[in-house]
């Protein structure tokens, strides 16, 4: 029996929420407060993540799973598992080292995060600008100028959606 037992790791019997305690002859002890083990056979419990400051708790830590954080209002998550919180800006702005700045002319941002992106260049797709762009919205491209020959209606129903980057046949 002793020989068989020595071949098997005694820690493998410890379930999630416990740890194999070196200090107690490798018995399975419950994780102490503010710690967890998400898998069995662990020799230690891990310290629970604390959602402090700009982070707020989305899910409390339990003996078998870590806490999960998100960001307080006015901030949004960045990185795996919301490892960072970044300040929100208004639509039409982007976050710089000096804070939120309006998008430069010719660029837009329709979200509270991310960077300002250039307006679509309608002419690259052989189209014309139907609606001008703003800091918050991209331009809307309309039919190509050739499609707007005299007598043609400029309010024809929109063509079926095409793959981006493909020009009309």
């Amino acid at each position: 029996f002793e020989r068989t037992r020595s071949l098997q790791d005694p820690c493998s019997n410890c379930p999630a929420g416990t740890f194999c305690d070196n200090n107690r002859n490798q018995i399975c002890s419950p994780c102490p407060p503010n710690s967890f083990s998400s898998a069995g056979g662990q020799r230690t419990c891990d310290i629970c993540r604390q959602c402090k400051g700009v982070f707020r708790t989305r899910k409390e830590c339990s003996s078998t799973s870590n806490a999960e954080c998100d960001c307080t209002p006015g901030f949004h998550c960045l990185g795996a598992g919301c490892s960072m919180c970044e300040q929100d800006c208004k639509q039409g702005q982007e976050l710089t080292k000096k804070g939120c700045k309006d998008c430069c002319f010719g660029t837009f941002n329709d979200q509270k995060r991310g960077i300002c992106r250039p307006w679509t260049n309608c002419s690259l797709d052989g189209k014309s600008v139907l609606v001008n762009g703003t800091k918050e919205r991209d331009v809307v491209c309309g039919p190509s100028p050739a499609d707007l020959s005299p007598g043609a209606s400029s309010v024809t129903p929109p063509a079926p959606a095409r793959e981006p980057g493909h020009s009309p046949q």
Epitope: F19, N22, N23, S35, T44, D46, I47
Partner: antibody, heavy 120, light 107 residues
Amino acid sequence: QVQLVQSGAEVKKPGASVKVSCKASGYTFTSYWINWVRQAPGQGLEWMGNIYPSDTYTNYNQKFKDRVTMTRDTSTSTVYMELSSLRSEDTAVYYCARMGDPFYYAVDYWGQGTLVTVSS
Amino acid sequence: DIQMTQSPSSLSASVGDRVTITCRASQDISNYLNWYQQKPGKAPKLLIYYTSRLHSGVPSRFSGSGSGTDFTFTISSLQPEDIATYYCQQGHTLPYTFGPGTKLEIK
């Protein structure tokens, strides 16, 4: 803040016993292991054993097993380490040290040390 | 008992240098490896636990890596206050054991 305050230096004769105390403050005394580590002059660190104050569970290094006893007094948040049958090679600084929670088996806070000199 | 060895036993480096100390265990200790700093006449201080985790208040120039039997401790840019002896310690199996130490001096 966490503090471990040890008793003062001792001079003992060979064959005698010494009892070193370690008073803890700044945390829940019964929830953390207290370890004893010694360091002979100019030498490295040697783990002697530990005690869990909540239930007095102890682990002793086999090297000291027959000579060392670790106890605690929860009313004063104090841990004691007694070493008997002293010999000259037991001359060392004796440290108590708290084992961090939740058990990465690292000692995160140390006492200031107690010098025990064994000399005839 | 698990034997811990450290190399070098002593080293001399200049301020700003990158310093590396290695620690080897006589058997697999997973990631249960801790590093301590001890200055003359003082108690040791925990710097790194569980191979690579920085103890609270420890400057980020200290780091650790490794797994199994081979571990590395690094000071990315040596400062005058880093002059000390550094010890590794295994926390995998009783009795817990320390390396013999590496004495770090300034050139």
